[in-house]
Amino acid sequence: FERTRSLQDPCSNCPAGTFCDNNRNQICSPCPPNSFSSAGGQRTCDICRQCKGVFRTRKECSSTSNAECDCTPGFHCLGAGCSMCEQDCKQGQELTKKGCKDCCFGTFNDQKRGICRPWTNCSLDGKSVLVNGTKERDVVCGPSPADLSPGASSVTPPAPAREPGHSPQ
């Protein structure tokens, strides 16, 4: 089948990094500068993505693969393939339409991106607050109040802080 196909369509012989040039009797020509073809048999090469301005190049374009971008310092990627760059905020803040705003009381953000999330409610797990929360850090839950009553033979070691979920890239 492959042999039959190549006899019928000379373009199927053109490898990645080339295109089937109709202007030159369907011979395989290398992709011009700033373009690529990631598969064989292409009739055109695709333009390389340009990582300029707020974007910067993470991986250079080659004749067989597109460029990959990330964001300049102070910004982070959003969307598939870093389609957008969003402003970083400080820990303890979240990005709103009006810029970076401090987390409201009772919420925290331990990253430079994403939203402020509520402190863990220790009492839901039958525990007490061992370390108070801040804008930048979740509360640390400790042993239940009953475990701390006088005469208790031992103190339960504090439970590790709940791992905050990471906001999507």
Epitope: N34, I47, C48, Q50, G53, V54, M84, E86, Q87
Partner: antibody
Framework: QLQLQESGPGLVRPSETLSLTCTVS????????WTWIRQPPGKALEWIGY???????RYSPSLKSRVSMSVDTSRNQFSLHLNSVTAADTAVYYC????????????WGRGTLVTVSS | QSVVTQPPSASGTPGQRVTISCSGS????????VSWYQHVPGTAPKLLIY???QRPSGVPDRFSGSKSGTSASLAISGLQSEDEADYYC???????????LGGGTKVTVL
């Protein structure tokens, strides 16, 4: 269909600040580079600067000391401010959208003539 | 004075082929892609070519673009009276972190 429309005063006094707004209708201002380009009478198009939806901006070196841009994502608008204007700033001012992956201006406003005169 | 240079004028009779050059340097055309615009005074500029040689839908195939080294060119084959306009090349300049536009070429159909 996405459209751009420039608005602002058609006459500005010398030494004052020229302020123009470009309203983006029929689509979002998120992503893309939003640019200002001008054409003085009888002269070539001149790139002024761009702003990204997150506020990141860059300006032409020849205008850098006098120009600033801002963006209001809630209103889908971006603005140009050019201070200490002279008669040489008289021009048709265009706002345009630039594709941030392939860096071409694919959508333009109709342009607005700003005259600097006393 | 633009850092990207174009001839101020070009002309041809209907049906002829006209080529406009756009010359730059390593920091702009040499390392970036080029776009071309048609500008009829009193109207908004129109995108003709992007990515050195790609035509947006709706642009006649009489318009073609190419790039080699630090120069680019726009060719108009089968020149028509409605092609009379100013033509501009544009590209990114890495040293400016912004765009540069050529000085424009006025095409006259004789």
């Amino acid at each position: 269909q996405l459209q751009l429309q420039e608005s602002g005063p058609g006459l500005v006094r010398p030494s004052e600040t020229l302020s123009l707004t470009c309203t983006v209708s029929g689509g979002s201002i998120s992503s893309f580079y939003w640019t200002w380009i001008r054409q003085p009478p009888g002269k070539a198009l001149e790139w002024i600067g761009y702003i990204y939806h997150n506020g990141y901006s860059r300006y032409s070196p020849s205008l850098k000391s006098r120009v600033s841009m801002s963006v209001d994502t809630s209103r889908n608008q971006f603005s140009l401010h050019l201070n200490s204007v002279t008669a040489a700033d008289t021009a048709v001012y265009y706002c345009a959208r630039a594709n941030n992956d392939y860096l071409f201006f694919d959508l333009w406003g109709r342009g607005t003539l700003v005259t600097v005169s006393s | 004075q633009s850092v990207v240079t174009q001839p101020p004028s070009a002309s041809g009779t209907p049906g002829q082929r006209v080529t406009i050059s756009c010359s730059g340097s390593r920091s702009n055309i040499g390392s970036n892609i080029v776009s071309w615009y048609q500008h009829v005074p009193g109207t908004a500029p129109k995108l003709l070519i992007y990515g050195n040689a790609q035509r947006p839908s709706g642009v006649p195939d009489r318009f073609s673009g190419s790039k080699s080294g630090t120069s680019a060119s726009l060719a108009i084959s089968g020149l028509q009276s409605e092609d009379e306009a100013d033509y501009y090349c544009a590209t990114w300049d890495d040293s400016l972190s912004g765009w540069v536009l050529g000085g424009g070429t006025k095409v006259t159909v004789l």
